[in-house]
Interface confidence: medium
Amino acid sequence: YDFTNCDFEKIKAAYLSTISKDLITYMSGTKSTEFNNTVSCSNRPHCLTEIQSLTFNPTAGCASLAKEMFAMKTKAALAIWCPGYSETQINATQAMKKRRKRKVTTNKCLEQVSQLQGLWRRFNRPLLKQQ
């Protein structure tokens, strides 16, 4: 999916108002310095591409993020503010439902969510000065 046409300001608002808090809740008890950020992005469409990948694509050692509160809110924000996004996700969602539910917060998942926090911060990168 090409995220170029998303309403970035609305997604930013969704992140600030709720997704950021859910990410913090998920990471509670973990020191902010525990994981190094190894994933980055260089503009907002690129960030959303990386955020979608880390949030919804199962990875070795962490297959359970898609059911987390921050993930569901991320999906809702993308569906609402990115034209045509929800249509591209129908097959992926159906495949996800077939997966066994398993609520285990592994260290790998914590590391992955730490990367997500970094990507969201990059997406939301504050303009230090009005230029």
Epitope: T4, S42, N43, P45, H46, L128, K129, Q130, Q131
Partner: antibody
């Protein structure tokens, strides 16, 4: 590793044309704004042109406007600078430069090529 | 068009602190970046967004920006810091990148 490699420099007569190319590798080229910056022998840095990550916008220094054209091919990870009506004052090392693109073009240049020399002389 | 003014040269003894200034009208309202260039080499980013530092750059390099002056500070200067230093901003009124004229840092 991440790198930018310029090519196409050389000696050219005033009024003639030259096309510079820059091959990018090791990073997501299509997500970065790309610039050309030049440096005349013994002089400081002079910005030449920028093209946005998706090619939707270009801006040029007043000194090259109407003569130079910046283009990119994201499918081939290449940046180009078509230089027409060259003048002696265009003689310089031309650097291909990468910049993350968040808010228009206010970002820093975080990756530079090694440069290619262009000499305009009769 | 927007103009950035740097001193042509700054000299400092090893171990001392070097301060290189970059003047511009209300530059404090812009994001300033600094580059180091050694002879025969391409420039390298040393400070971005006024005061942030790329991970590979030593902590000795720092930046500040307010009013009409941005400053690059190099503490505990080493011989290897000898180079030309350039400040840079994006001028939104003209949609142009603007560089300062450069400052040659000499380590005595």
């Amino acid at each position: 590793q991440m790198q930018l490699v310029e090519s196409g420099g050389g000696v050219v007569q005033p009024g003639r044309s030259l096309r510079l190319s820059c091959a990018a590798s090791g990073f997501a080229f299509r997500t970065y704004g790309m610039h050309w910056v030049r440096q005349a022998p013994g002089k400081g840095l002079e910005w030449v042109a920028v093209i946005w990550y998706d090619g939707s916008n270009t801006h040029y220094a007043d000194s090259v406007k109407g003569r130079f054209t910046i283009t990119r091919d994201n499918s081939k990870n290449t940046l180009n600078l078509q230089m027409n009506s060259l003048r002696a004052e265009d003689t310089a090392v031309y650097y291909c430069v990468r910049a993350p693109q968040w808010y228009l073009s206010a970002e820093a240049f975080d990756l530079w090529g090694q440069g290619t020399m262009v000499t305009v002389s009769s | 068009s927007y103009v950035l003014t740097q001193p042509p040269s700054v000299s400092v003894a090893p171990g001392q602190t070097a301060r290189i200034t970059c003047g511009g009208n209300l530059i404090g309202a812009k994001l300033v970046h600094w580059y180091q260039q050694k002879p025969g080499q391409a420039p390298v980013l040393v400070v971005y967004d006024d005061s942030d530092r790329p991970s590979r750059i030593p902590e000795r390099f720092s930046g500040s920006n307010s009013g009409n002056t941005a400053t690059l500070t190099i503490s505990r200067v080493e011989a290897g810091d000898e180079a030309d230093y350039y400040c840079q901003v994006w001028d939104h009124s003209s949609d142009h990148v603007v560089f300062g004229g450069g400052t040659k840092l000499t380590v005595l």
